[in-house]
């Protein structure tokens, strides 16, 4: 049928919870293409009706929730004007055992459910949540050995759990839990993560480089909205935390009540030798108290600030 076959690695999935897989294969999906999902080489496409438990949502296949019988090979066919690619995804459903203390790690989990913390460092775990825009995700709760994580060494930031001064006791079985809402229905997502520890620097001890800001000032009018990107290059294997702080406090915590100033979601682009990270800070409305205050972008041991200043008066207007 003239389609190129591409085989993705197997995905191990948890029964009784939502799961989604996005059919993207750059640069194929960057142009004008049509994407259709099929199961087990069936000629009948996966339903696009949003009420269906399994349905296609734009380029995604969405399971609400995943069930035992859903194991199998799924194909998404990407058709362009002059091309056709068929991507095969093998999904295997298993019963989750996050609270079974006899299970010392779950060896068949995919890599994003195995994470490493670096002893003596400030590090983080990531709750990988890959869902289409139609899915609304609530706040994330974190658990270790089935107990909710508390304590001043732990901070929840977006999809990450920040762990300060990692110790040997931090290894073990973690889970992140979030409520997903789709078409008015709620579902629980519980991702188990096996967390191991290492003393190795892991990235050769190199220091992340903050490309912008450069300890510079920005002229901005009172009352305006402002978005500033922090651009960082770092090694591919780095474990550095990237965030915005003011008065040595995470901006999301400092402006917790008003939410007037917020940190954005981190994105990254992967290059051959390094990753380029971007994390922005948004001022919904610049206030007088913001001027002259250093807003610090942190990346591991590196830091750089921006300072807001009022524009110089334009005497030509008089």
């Amino acid at each position: 049928d003239g389609c190129n076959d591409i085989f993705m690695k197997n995905e191990m999935l948890s029964a009784s919870q939502p799961f989604a897989f996005n059919c993207t294969f750059p640069p194929i999906t960057s142009g004008e293409v049509s994407v259709t999902w099929y199961k087990n080489s069936s000629k009948i496409p996966v339903s696009k009706i949003i009420q269906s438990r399994i349905h296609q949502d734009e380029t995604w296949i969405l399971f609400l929730p995943m069930e035992w019988g859903d194991s199998g090979v799924y194909q998404c066919v990407i058709k362009g004007r002059d091309s056709c690619h068929r991507i095969h995804v093998n999904l295997t459903v298993f019963e989750k055992q996050w609270c079974d203390t006899s299970v010392k790690g779950l060896p068949n989990l995919s890599d994003e459910y195995k994470q490493i913390l670096h002893l003596g460092k400030d590090d983080s775990l990531t709750c990988h949540l890959h869902f289409p825009k139609s899915c609304i995700l609530g706040p994330i709760k974190w658990y270790k050995d089935c107990n909710e994580i508390t304590g001043e060494r732990f901070t929840v930031l977006e999809t990450r759990l920040l762990v300060s001064n990692v110790s040997a006791e931090d290894r073990g079985n973690y889970a992140c839990q979030v409520i997903l809402t789709h078409s008015g229905k709620q579902y629980e997502v519980l991702n188990g993560i096996t967390v191991s520890i290492t003393e190795r620097a892991g990235y050769g001890g190199s220091v992340p480089k903050i490309i912008y800001p450069k300890n510079n000032s920005i002229e901005v009018q009172l009352g305006t909205t402002l978005i500033v990107d922090c651009n960082i290059t770092d090694t591919k294997d780095n474990t550095n935390l990237r965030c915005w702080r003011v008065n040595n406090t995470l901006v999301d915590d400092y402006y917790n009540e008003s939410k007037r100033i917020r940190e954005g979601v981190e994105t990254h682009a992967s290059f051959r030798e390094y990753n380029l990270y971007t994390v922005n800070i948004t001022f919904l409305e610049v206030k007088m108290e913001d001027y002259g205050l250093p807003f610090m972008c942190h990346a591991g041991v590196s830091a750089a600030y921006i300072m807001l200043q009022l524009p110089a008066p334009d005497f030509r207007a008089y």
Partner: antibody
Framework: QVQLQESGPGLVKPSQTLSLTCTVS??????GYWNWIRNHPGKGLEYI?????????YYNPSLKSRVTISRDTSKNQFSLKLSSVTAADTAVYYC??????????????WGQGTLVTVSS | DIQMTQSPSSLSASVGDRVTITCRAS?????MYWYQQKPGKAPKLWIY???NLASGVPSRFSGSGSGTSYTLTISSLQPEDFATYYC?????????FGQGTKLEIK
């Protein structure tokens, strides 16, 4: 059960390149750290280097100018190349990995080792 | 580089003896790892994170220490314990081993 198996020539001529491969079963080399260690005859263990889950490589500075560790994720293998060898590189070479009790540095799984002799 | 010095380099002892092997680091290390190696065999993880015994290691073995001084102790030596023991650190690269302590039957 994680298993590692070294393979490669047992005899290498001086000034040539030593090449060994470690084939892994029971675990994916895209998780954890994958190490090379050698044991000189009648001497102790020497840490050569590792390749990590992301493909990052670390080399012992004493060997850095001569060593390359690479991987082939499709075959679940990682390899060691040591250039410009001399008789001092004669040793039993081991591949090993950790992760025991969630400790990556605890090298619990080892290959059986392969003796490489450098001689003309 | 952190130098790891094991003492003694070799030790003759009898079955039933209490034996202590010391590993001294030239700078502070966070944790110590110990390996047992028998002739013609690959090393085996013996003690990790300074004091934790690996699977299958008898309880007569123990590990302790902090900073620059670490010890492996055998409370009552058994015939199968005769081997070479190595310490290793991961705190600072390069990740150095001690030169080994060869435990022999007296």
């Amino acid at each position: 059960q994680v298993q590692l198996q070294e393979s490669g020539p047992g005899l290498v001529k001086p000034s040539q390149t030593l090449s060994l491969t470690c084939t892994v079963s029971g675990a994916s080399i895209t998780s954890g750290y994958w190490n090379w260690i050698r044991n000189h005859p009648g001497k102790g263990l020497e840490y050569i280097g590792y390749i990590s889950y992301s493909g990052y490589t670390y080399y012992n500075p004493s060997l850095k100018s001569r060593v390359t560790i690479s991987r082939d994720t499709s075959k679940n293998q990682f390899s060691l190349k040591l250039s410009s060898v001399t008789a001092a590189d004669t040793a039993v070479y081991y591949c090993a990995t950790g992760g025991y009790d969630y400790v990556e540095d605890a090298l619990y799984y080892w290959g059986q080792g392969t003796l490489v002799t450098v001689s003309s | 580089d952190i130098q790891m010095t094991q003492s003694p380099s070799s030790l003759s002892a009898s079955v039933g003896d209490r034996v202590t092997i010391t590993c001294r680091a030239s700078s502070n290390v966070r944790y110590m790892y110990w390996y047992q190696q028998k002739p013609g065999k690959a090393p085996k993880l013996w003690i990790y994170l300074t004091s934790n015994l690996a699977s299958g290691v008898p309880s007569r073995f123990s590990g302790s220490g902090s900073g620059t001084s670490y010890t492996l102790t055998i409370s009552s030596l058994q015939p199968e314990d005769f081997a070479t023991y190595y310490c290793q650190q991961y705190t600072t690269s390069p990740y150095t081993f001690g030169q080994g302590t060869k435990l022999e039957i007296k």
